[in-house]
Amino acid sequence: WPPPGTGDVVVQAPTQVPGFLGDSVTLPCYLQVPNMEVTHVSQLTWARHGESGSMAVFHQTQGPSYSESKRLEFVAARLGAELRNASLRMFGLRVEDEGNYTCLFVTFPQGSRSVDIWLRVLAKPQNTAEVQKVQLTGEPVPMARCVSTGGRPPAQITWHSDLGGMPNTSQVPGFLSGTVTVTSLWILVPSSQVDGKNVTCKVEHESFEKPQLLTVNLTVYYPPEVSISGYDNNWYLGQNEATLTCDARSNPEPTGYNWSTTMGPLPPFAVAQGAQLLIRPVDKPINTTLICNVTNALGARQAELTVQVKEGPPSEHSGISRN
């Protein structure tokens, strides 16, 4: 703007105005007249850059005229009133409406005063995120998918995770002309450690007040990972019964547990109770390798544990308690 005291009339308008596809938008434009300055406005004109002629004119004696009367309207200019507000409303915004517009006041005696306004036509995208359920492949595969549908301009998609991973983003035209659908895949080598973890898809767009965050819970299908717990190498004759647990991680959940030994079926002192194995007291030393075989929809895996029951002073053991 000119410095105060120059006595000049100035057209005030934002340099850029956003509007949404299909909606209406007002292009604001005002004449600022210094206190002591006399000015007379005889005409308001709107023109689009690169096009001949005016799209909207408000003449002090003839009133308004429009190139498209159903889509344009002076919001404040009235016959018989001082013309100080040239703000123009546009209805049914189209992609092709995006561009530079000039708002011009014909003032006397100051002359023509104008300002340029850039109209941005936006479309607010719809965002979704979903898991891509995978099995152990040994190679990078898409594990999550984030889609921003029908944005203008295209949305920006980024992924946030402490698991690493690489994005693969692509764009295709949206359903509405001038819009874009952005798809981003989050790619990683699947592992059981990743199953159940979260990754976040962040979608940024001019139409959002703040970025949209969509969380995806990862799913990796894998066969059981098996271990046996409950044995501390300190079992002695004459102790009470003890319990071994077959610990299995898998997706989907295990469907069955089977206990055996390397010699075949379980000995009489070992009783299977699902994922647990009850070891009853014995009266002679043993050295047996126990096997827990766990099954899920993807297969079976097993773990082995060699158990020794030794002779020794009851007071010194730390395993199973004496009667």
Partner: antibody, heavy 121, light 109 residues
Framework: QVQLVQSGAEVKKPGASVKVSCKAS????????ISWVRQAPGQGLEWIAW????????NYNQKFTGRVTMTTDTSTSTAYMELRSLRSDDTAVYYC??????????????WGQGTTVTVSS | QAVVTQEPSLTVSPGGTVTLTCRSS?????????ANWVQQKPGQAFRGLIG???NRAPGVPARFSGSLLGDKAALTLSGAQPEDEAEYYC?????????FGGGTKLTVL
């Protein structure tokens, strides 16, 4: 061709009124701004007022406020300037001038031939 | 009350260049003063030459140009012709009124 033709010379007594006319041709009268200017004998030019012909909106030099009235008749494309309570120092040649636009600014484009007003007892 | 001052008279040789200036009693002349220049030849009506400081009117020869020169408005005539001999008036706008300069009598000799 744009022309402004003014009414003939007037002789008035002090305290009387005078109404000078300025007939326009060759352009759209209702879209024009017309100024009135005077030049007293041996003096410089003095701006009196302007009028927007389309609406009759006016702006007067404060020196003349209350004594001068500018009007237009769009049916005859004529502008009028009436000066009341005439004094001897109102003796002058009165001009109408149409403002035209050049580039993005206005200029004093076309002038009438002038009307001599003599105030004498 | 603003006073607009011009050189009372100037002389230029045919083909020569001359600059007429227009000073304001209120300070520097700026574009907000919308400087206008008009010409009056003896026995003829006034004719507008320049509007808005530097916009030449249609039909006015390119040898006439308007500008701001320091703190004054200026009319420069480059390549003066005998028919340019006339009285030249500067007009400045002061927020709510026009004020005329006293005029410069230009002689082409």
């Amino acid at each position: 061709q744009v022309q402004l033709v003014q009414s003939g010379a007037e002789v008035k007594k002090p305290g009387a009124s005078v109404k000078v006319s300025c007939k326009a041709s060759g352009y759209t009268f209702t879209s024009s701004y017309i100024s009135w200017v005077r030049q007293a004998p041996g003096q410089g030019l003095e701006w009196i007022a302007w009028i927007y012909a389309g609406t009759g909106d006016t702006n007067y030099n404060q020196k003349f406020t209350g004594r001068v009235t500018m009007t237009t008749d769009t049916s005859t494309s004529t502008a009028y300037m009436e000066l009341r309570s005439l004094r001897s120092d109102d003796t002058a040649v009165y001009y109408c001038a149409r403002h035209g636009m050049t580039g993005r600014g206005w200029y004093f484009a076309v002038w009438g031939q002038g009307t001599t007003v003599t105030v004498s007892s | 009350q603003a006073v607009v001052t011009q050189e009372p008279s100037l002389t230029v040789s045919p083909g020569g260049t001359v600059t007429l200036t227009c000073r304001s009693s209120t300070g520097a002349v700026t574009t907000s003063n919308l400087a206008n220049w008009v010409q009056q030849k003896p026995g003829q009506a006034f004719r507008g030459l320049i509007g808005h400081t530097n916009n030449r009117a249609p039909g006015v020869p390119a040898r006439f140009s308007g500008s701001l020169l320091g703190d004054k408005a200026a009319l420069t005539l480059s390549g003066a012709q005998p028919e340019d001999e006339a009285e030249y008036y500067c007009i400045l706008w002061y927020s709510n009124k026009f004020v005329f300069g006293g005029g410069t009598k230009l002689t082409v000799l």
